[in-house]
Interface confidence: low
C-alpha cells in the first residue's frame, strides 16, 4: 500500500516570494508522484516545478497559484493511486493603481459647490488601509468638507470648492507592504476671484533706439491688480520708474511700452497678476536687443571655366537670425539659373570667363546690414603666342627657346630637358614671359626641350629640338708647358673637334721644320729619342673649312729626371745627441731639396737653432728630444718632376751601463754618437 509520510498543508505566502508544498510517500514498489491544481495536472515551469516529490515555487503568483493543490502517488505496475490532503495558499499582496474620478462622470461636469468623489485603485490582500494626499499633504478623515471611506477606497469632497484644487494622490499599506498611486488626479475648480491669464507677454527683439511693447492681461472678479517688474525686481509704474527705465509707460490695459531702447533695457520683464484670492500669477518675457556681428574677409577664389563651384557665405551671428543674400554688379542673385543662390551658397554652374568679378555676400537683420566681397577669377587654359622652335645654338654662347602663352591668371611655365624638369641654376634661367635661356651652350645641350604652360584650368605643351653648333676647339687644350725625359721616347698629343673634323698639325714656333726623328702623326708629336735640341716652343694648329684655324702654343723642356744619390736611412739617436739624415739628389734642371717632418714641411727660414739643412740637402737636428721622433721625408723637385724618399728617426734614452758589461760593449742597436 502507498503511504504519505509528509502531506502538503495550507499556508500563508507572500506575492513574488518562495514557497514549498511538501509531499513524501512510501510504497513497496516504484511509484511516480505528480501534482494537481484544482484537479488538473501541474506542468513544470521555471517559476513552479517539482523538486523530488515536493512542489517548489520560485515566486508565488496570486493569480496562477490560487486554488487547491493535491499530491498524487501512483504505482504504474499495480495501478494503485493515493491522493494527499488538499492544500492552498493564503497569498498576501498589494498592487498600485491610479486615482480616478468616480463622481461626477467627467471632469467637465465639476463645478464649484458640487460633490466630487475620487477612488484609489490600490488593491491587496489582506485589504490595505488607505491614506489620501493633496499636493503632498496628508488628508485626515473627518476634516472639514471631505470624508474618507476606507472600505470604498473613496475620498468625497462635499461641497467641492476652489480651496480643494490640487494634485490628489493616495497610498495604501497592509501586512504585505505599501504602495502609492501610479497616476494622480489634478482637481481644478475655478474661483472667480482668482487671477486668470488672458494675454501673456511674448519675447521681443528690437533694434537699438526703437520701441518695444509687452502685452499682459489678467481677469478675475473683482478685477485683479497688475504689476510690472524688471530684472532686479524693480517695480515699473507711471509714477515711479527706475533710472534706467525713464522711457517706460504702463497702459490701463496692462501693456508696457519702452521707447528708445538701449542695451541696459535688455533683460527679463515680469508681469504679476493678483486676484482677491489665490496665488499671484507671474509671467515672464525677455527683451533682446537686435545685434549683428561683422563678417570677416573672404579669400579670393580662382575657378576654371566649365566647372561648377560654390562659395559659402558663413552668416554672421545675430539676433534675430540674419537673412543672407548674394549680389553681383549691384544685382541680387536669383534662386535658380546658371549663377544663383542656394541657401547661403553662391553657385556658379558651367562657369564662363564673364563670371569673373566681385561678388558680395550681404547679411541683414533688425540691427543692420553687413557685407563682404569675394574676388572671383575665372582661369582659362593657356593659348600660344609663340611656341618653341627647333633651333641651332652656338656652343659657348647664350641660347634662347621661346614659350610665350597667355591666360588668366598668368600661366606658370616649366621646362623639361630629356623629360627631366629643368631647375633654375647658373646655366638655366626661365624668364617671366616663359622664355628659357641657356647661359653658355654646351655640346651635350643638343637634345629635346619641352615647355609646359599651366593655369588651374589646364595646360598646353610643345617641344623643340636643339642642335648645338660646335665651336672649333682643342679637346683637351694641350698643356702649355711640358717636360720630356732626356734620351727617352716621348709623345705630345693634340686633338680638336669642330662642326667638321679638323686637320691637326704641329710646327716649331720659329717656323722651322721638325727634325727627321720627330714625327707628327694625326696630331701626336712623337720624339723617337729626346735630345737637348728638342727643347723649345711648338705650335699645334687645328683647322677646318667653315671655321678657320686655332692654335695652341706648347713650351717643351728637356730634362734629366730626378734620382737620389744618397737616401736617408732608419736612424736611432740618444736623447740630447745630434741626428744626421742624409739626402742628395741629381737631375737636370738641378733639383731643390725640401724636408717634411711630422707631416709638415720644414721651412728653412723658420727651423730655429736646433735644425739645419745643408746645401747638399742633408738635415741635421741637434740636441734631439723624444718629440723629434717620427718619419722624415726628403722631397726633391725641379720644374719637370718631383720625387721623395723617407726614413724614420727614433730618439731613445741613453742606457745606464751595468757592471757585467764591459766598457767597450756595443749598444743594442745602430746609433749615431756625437
Amino acid at each position: 500500500a502507498i503511504v504519505f509520510i509528509k502531506q502538503p498543508s495550507s499556508q500563508d505566502a507572500l506575492q513574488g516570494r518562495r514557497a514549498l508544498l511538501r509531499c513524501e510517500v512510501e510504497a513497496p514498489g516504484p511509484v511516480h508522484v505528480y501534482w494537481l491544481l484544482d484537479g488538473a495536472p501541474v506542468q513544470d515551469t521555471e517559476r513552479r516545478f517539482a523538486q523530488g516529490s515536493s512542489l517548489s515555487f520560485a515566486a508565488v503568483d496570486r493569480l496562477q497559484d490560487s486554488g487547491t493543490f493535491q499530491c498524487v502517488a501512483r504505482d504504474d505496475v499495480t495501478g494503485e493511486e493515493a491522493r494527499s490532503a488538499n492544500a492552498s495558499f493564503n497569498i498576501k499582496w498589494i498592487e498600485a493603481g491610479p486615482v480616478v474620478l468616480k463622481h461626477p462622470a467627467s471632469e467637465a461636469e465639476i463645478q464649484p459647490q458640487t460633490q466630487v468623489t475620487l477612488r484609489c485603485h490600490i488593491d491587496g490582500h489582506p485589504r490595505p488601509t488607505y491614506q489620501w494626499f493633496r499636493d503632498g499633504t496628508p488628508l485626515s478623515d473627518g476634516q472639514s468638507n471631505h470624508t474618507v471611506s476606507s472600505k470604498e477606497r473613496n475620498l468625497t469632497l462635499r461641497p467641492a470648492g476652489p480651496e480643494h484644487s490640487g494634485l490628489y494622490s493616495c497610498c495604501a499599506h497592509s501586512a504585505f507592504g505599501q504602495a502609492c498611486s501610479s497616476q494622480n488626479f489634478t482637481l481644478s475648480i475655478a474661483d472667480e476671484s482668482f487671477a486668470r491669464v488672458v494675454l501673456a507677454p511674448q519675447d521681443v527683439v528690437v533694434a537699438r533706439y526703437e520701441e518695444a511693447m509687452f502685452h499682459c492681461q489678467f481677469s478675475a472678479q473683482p478685477p485683479p491688480s497688475l504689476q510690472w517688474l524688471f530684472e532686479d525686481e524693480t517695480p515699473i509704474t507711471n509714477r515711479s520708474r527706475p533710472p534706467h527705465l525713464r522711457r517706460a509707460t504702463v497702459f490701463a490695459n496692462g501693456s508696457l511700452l519702452l521707447t528708445q531702447v538701449r542695451p541696459r533695457n535688455a533683460g527679463i520683464y515680469r508681469c504679476i497678476g493678483q486676484g482677491q484670492r489665490g496665488p499671484p500669477i507671474i509671467l515672464e518675457a525677455t527683451l533682446h536687443l537686435a545685434e549683428i556681428e561683422d563678417m570677416p574677409l573672404f579669400e579670393p577664389r580662382v575657378f576654371t571655366a566649365g566647372s561648377e563651384e560654390r562659395v559659402t557665405c558663413l552668416p554672421p551671428k545675430g539676433l534675430p537670425e540674419p537673412s543672407v543674400w548674394w549680389e553681383h554688379a549691384g544685382v541680387r542673385l536669383p534662386t535658380h539659373g546658371r549663377v544663383y543662390q542656394k541657401g547661403h551658397e553662391l553657385v556658379l554652374a558651367n562657369i564662363a570667363e564673364s563670371d569673373a568679378g566681385v561678388y558680395t555676400c550681404h547679411a541683414a537683420n533688425l540691427a543692420g546690414q553687413r557685407r563682404q566681397d569675394v574676388n572671383i577669377t575665372v582661369a582659362t587654359v593657356p593659348s600660344w603666342l609663340k611656341k618653341p622652335q627647333d633651333s641651332q645654338l652656338e656652343e659657348g654662347k647664350p641660347g634662347y627657346l621661346d614659350c610665350l602663352t597667355q591666360a588668366t591668371p598668368k600661366p606658370t611655365v616649366v621646362w623639361y630637358r630629356n623629360q627631366m624638369l629643368i631647375s633654375e641654376d647658373s646655366r638655366f634661367e626661365v624668364f617671366k614671359n616663359g622664355t628659357l635661356r641657356i647661359n653658355s651652350v654646351e655640346v651635350y645641350d643638343g637634345t629635346w626641350y619641352r615647355c609646359m604652360s599651366s593655369t588651374p584650368a589646364g595646360s598646353i605643351e610643345a617641344q623643340a629640338r636643339v642642335q648645338v653648333l660646335e665651336k672649333l676647339k682643342f679637346t683637351p687644350p694641350p698643356q702649355p708647358q711640358q717636360c720630356m725625359e732626356f734620351d727617352k721616347e716621348a709623345t705630345v698629343p693634340c686633338s680638336a673637334t669642330g662642326r667638321e673634323k679638323p686637320t691637326i698639325k704641329w710646327e716649331r714656333a720659329d717656323g722651322s721644320s721638325l727634325p727627321e726623328w720627330v714625327t707628327d702623326n694625326a696630331g701626336t708629336l712623337h720624339f723617337a729619342r729626346v735630345t737637348r735640341d728638342d727643347a723649345g716652343n711648338y705650335t699645334c694648329i687645328a683647322s677646318n673649312g667653315p671655321q678657320g684655324q686655332i692654335r695652341a702654343h706648347v713650351q717643351l723642356t728637356v730634362a734629366v729626371f730626378i734620382t737620389f744619390k744618397v737616401e736617408p736611412e732608419r736612424t736611432t739617436v740618444y736623447q740630447g745627441h745630434t741626428a744626421l739624415l742624409q739626402c742628395e739628389a741629381q737631375g737636370d734642371p738641378k733639383p731643390l731639396i725640401q724636408w717634411k717632418g711630422k707631416d709638415r714641411i720644414l721651412d728653412p727660414t723658420k727651423l730655429g737653432p736646433r735644425m739645419h739643412i745643408f746645401q747638399n740637402g742633408s738635415l741635421v737636428i741637434h740636441d734631439v728630444a723624444p718629440e723629434d721622433s717620427g718619419r722624415y721625408t726628403c722631397i726633391a723637385g725641379n720644374s719637370c718632376n718631383i720625387k721623395h724618399t723617407e726614413a724614420p728617426l727614433y730618439v731613445v734614452d741613453k742606457p745606464v751601463p751595468e757592471e757585467s758589461e764591459g766598457p767597450g760593449s756595443p749598444p743594442p742597436y745602430k746609433m749615431i754618437q756625437t
Epitope: E293, D294, P300, V302, L314, P315, N375, T377, K410
Partner: antibody, heavy 120, light 113 residues
Framework: QVQLQESGPGLVKPSQTLSLTCTVS??????????WSWIRQHPGKGLEWIGY???????YYTPSLKSRITISVDTSENQFSLKLNSVTAADTAVYYC????????????WGKGTTVTVSS | DIVMTQSPDSLAVSLGERATIDCKSS????????????LAWYQQKPGQPPKLIIY???TRESGVPDRFSGSGSGTDFTLTITSLQAEDVAIYYC?????????FGGGTKVEIK
C-alpha cells in the same frame, strides 16, 4: 621660396610724392590667392597697415591715408607699387611690403624694408 | 576700426623662465560661424622685418619652436614663451585680420633680466 624686395628713393622732399616698388621673386605673383600689402613703421614705433592690392587690381586703403595713397600692380614685372602724395615729416618711416595669405590677411612673407626720410 | 591693446609695454624675464604677453581687441574677433579667432602674433628683432609666429590665435607657423604658444578667444589673447632663450629677445606684436583696416597692437618689448 617667395621673396619680396622694396626699392625706391630713401629721401623725399616735403609736399612731394613718395614712390616705392616691391618686386616679388621665387613665385608666381599673378596666380591669385594672395593680397599684397604695404605696412610702415615710424622710428621707434609700432606697425601701421597702409593697404593691399590683389593681382587683378582690387585695392583697399587704410581710411587715414585713403586720400593720399595709390597702390598699383604690374603683373608682367611681378611688381606692385605704393605712391603717397603730399608727404610730410610724419611720413618718415621704414616701409615694408608683405604677402597676406588667402584672404586671411596675416602676413606670412615680408620684405626687408626700406627707410624713407621726408626732409628738405 | 578695431583697436588692439597690448600689455605690458616691456617685459624682463630670466633665461629659461616663462614670458606672457596679453593682447585685447576692442571688438570680438571670433567668428561664430567657423569658430576661428582672426588674430596673429609677430616677432620683430632689431633691424629686421616682423616674422609671423602664430595665426588663428593658436596655430604655430612652421619652423617656429614649440616654446611659443598662443591662446585666448573673442577679445582677450595671450602669447606665451614657456622657456625664454637669448634669441627670443625682440618686440612682439599682435594683429587682427577680422576686418579692414588691419590693425596691430602697440608691441611688447621682451628682454633678459
Amino acid at each position: 621660396q617667395v621673396q619680396l624686395q622694396e626699392s625706391g628713393p630713401g629721401l623725399v622732399k616735403p609736399s612731394q610724392t613718395l614712390s616705392l616698388t616691391c618686386t616679388v621673386s621665387g613665385g608666381s605673383f599673378s596666380s591669385g590667392g594672395y593680397y599684397w600689402s604695404w605696412i610702415r613703421q615710424h622710428p621707434g614705433k609700432g606697425l601701421e597697415w597702409i593697404g593691399y592690392i590683389y593681382y587683378s587690381g582690387t585695392t583697399y586703403y587704410t581710411p587715414s591715408l585713403k586720400s593720399r595713397i595709390t597702390i598699383s600692380v604690374d603683373t608682367s614685372e611681378n611688381q606692385f607699387s605704393l605712391k603717397l602724395n603730399s608727404v610730410t615729416a610724419a611720413d618718415t618711416a621704414v616701409y615694408y611690403c608683405a604677402r597676406a595669405g588667402f584672404g586671411y590677411y596675416y602676413m606670412d612673407v615680408w620684405g626687408k624694408g626700406t627707410t624713407v626720410t621726408v626732409s628738405s | 576700426d578695431i583697436v588692439m591693446t597690448q600689455s605690458p609695454d616691456s617685459l624682463a624675464v630670466s633665461l629659461g623662465e616663462r614670458a606672457t604677453i596679453d593682447c585685447k581687441s576692442s571688438q570680438n574677433v571670433l567668428y561664430s560661424s567657423n569658430n576661428k579667432n582672426y588674430l596673429a602674433w609677430y616677432q620683430q628683432k632689431p633691424g629686421q622685418p616682423p616674422k609671423l609666429i602664430i595665426y588663428w590665435a593658436s596655430t604655430r607657423e612652421s619652423g617656429v619652436p614649440d616654446r611659443f604658444s598662443g591662446s585666448g578667444s573673442g577679445t582677450d589673447f595671450t602669447l606665451t614663451i614657456t622657456s625664454l632663450q637669448a634669441e627670443d629677445v625682440a618686440i612682439y606684436y599682435c594683429q587682427q585680420y577680422y576686418s579692414t583696416p588691419l590693425t596691430f597692437g602697440g608691441g611688447t618689448k621682451v628682454e633678459i633680466k
